[in-house]
């Protein structure tokens, strides 16, 4: 906290600007009007303050505002948006996409800050909902971004959104989000002929069910063997060997070099051994020849 | 992560002069106003000099006359000429721009020691 004393003659200060950076801290107390400062602050981020400085700015805001600064003022923090900790941004009201921006600006090529996640959720919470342009906005920002939302979240997200997706900001996500986002995004492309459509749910699949896929192996689309090796194993066991062959196309011969890991390996243990065989990859581990199958799940929904 | 790195430092007699070269690592300096800070030993960090993206100067008071601030975008070079030092200008020197300053983001600065 910066003692109260009286500014010096000659040194109140009538604009903002780079002779600040000359005062000491109990001289930028003293000399600057927080009215000033405010109706200015699209200048502070052009002048090299000092951390120590900025300190004392942004207290005097907050003198100004106790209840939380105006939107006006928050668009043109810049810098000074860096010394604010959540507890001052759970005050703020930001409904403009442009301060929002501004603010993740400041932040741009750094890991999200808590005080970037608290802006972000205060922002989103304002507008009920994430819209394609702020999930453009901030999937830009933050590729990351989708991926760092829970399941409930991710529910708020209406279809028309994910043509913002692009496949990076799918990276981190777990199956649990991509269960959600899936049918959202099969909605969104819904009108999209086949191979197009491809190109644009594949990021998506590691939530599609098994009937999906087998639609989608009667498409001629060449899953490529990372995107088959993200898709869920529950819906990758019922698929026979003609199947995943259609589905892989001329990416079928990369199963031998998965064949320890799943799904691909549940699923090996799934098929009949002289079924594998005809794929002519050296496949181990099917249902040796003779052996009945029981699907046990079937057994009891039947009882 | 945009490196500061401050050069030209010495040492020098009362009366001399020093011209102080700051280099950054990234095109920061176009568009950005920089300034030039020391910090003698036991006092803290005070700017003595800063020139706005225009090419505007500005000087602490004491400094005025015997400082010159200029730069050099091209190279992302800034310059500090010191004329007539005295032993109170002894210090650290360090150079930065508005985004380093406000995160506390330094380079290792460059000794100036005026002592006959």
């Known amino acids: 906290e910066v003692e109260k004393t009286a500014c010096p003659s000659g040194k109140k200060a009538r604009e903002i600007d780079e002779s600040l950076i000359f005062y000491k801290k109990w001289e930028l107390e003293a000399c600057v009007d927080a009215a000033l400062l405010a109706t200015q602050m699209d200048r502070v981020n052009a002048i090299p303050f000092t951390y120590e400085q900025l300190d004392v700015l942004k207290h005097k805001l907050d003198e100004l505002y106790p209840q939380g600064y105006p939107e006006s003022v928050i668009q043109h923090l810049g810098y000074l948006f860096l010394k604010m900790s959540p507890e001052d941004i759970r005050k703020w009201n930001v409904t403009s996409l442009e301060t929002l921006k501004a603010l993740l600006e400041v932040n741009k090529g750094h890991e999200m800050s808590p005080q970037v996640a608290t802006l972000i959720d205060r922002f989103v919470k304002g507008r009920g909902q994430l819209d394609k342009d702020t999930l453009d906005t901030l999937t830009a920002f933050y590729p990351g971004y989708l991926c760092s939302l829970s399941p409930e979240e991710l529910s708020s997200v209406p279809p028309s959104s994910i043509w913002a997706v692009r496949p990076q900001d799918l990276d981190t996500c777990d199956p649990r989000q991509l269960d959600v986002l899936y049918p959202k995004a099969r909605l969104a492309f819904q009108n999209m002929n086949g191979s197009e459509y491809f190109v644009k749910i594949q990021s998506f699949l590691g939530g599609a069910p098994t009937e999906d896929l087998k639609a989608l192996s009667q498409q001629n689309v060449s899953m490529d063997l990372a995107t088959f090796m993200k898709l869920r194993t529950d819906a990758v066991l019922p698929l026979t060997v003609a199947e995943v062959q259609k589905l892989l196309g001329p990416h079928v011969e990369g199963l031998k070099a998965e064949e320890r890991h799943r799904p691909v390996r549940d699923w090996i243990l799934r098929q009949r051994q002289d079924d594998l065989d005809t794929l002519g990859l050296g496949l181990q581990g099917g249902i040796p020849n003779g052996y009945l199958v029981l699907d046990l799940s079937m057994q009891e929904a039947l009882s | 992560q945009v490196q500061l790195v401050e050069s030209g430092g010495g040492l020098v007699q009362p009366g001399g002069s020093l011209r102080l070269s700051c280099a950054a690592s990234?095109?920061?300096?176009?568009?950005?106003?920089v300034a030039w800070y020391r910090q003698a030993p036991g006092k803290e960090r005070e700017a003595v000099a800063v020139?706005?993206?225009?090419?505007?100067?500005k000087y602490a008071d004491s400094v005025k006359g015997r400082f010159t601030i200029s730069r050099y975008n091209a190279k992302n070079i800034a310059y500090l000429q010191m004329n007539s030092l005295k032993p109170e200008d002894t210090a650290v020197y360090y150079c930065?721009?508005?985004?380093?300053?406000?995160?506390?983001?330094w380079g290792q600065g460059t000794q100036v020691t005026v002592s006959s």
């Open positions: 020139i706005t993206r225009d090419g505007d100067t």
């Open positions: 990234g095109s920061i300096f176009s568009g950005n106003a």
């Open positions: 930065n721009t508005a985004r380093g300053a406000a995160v506390d983001s």
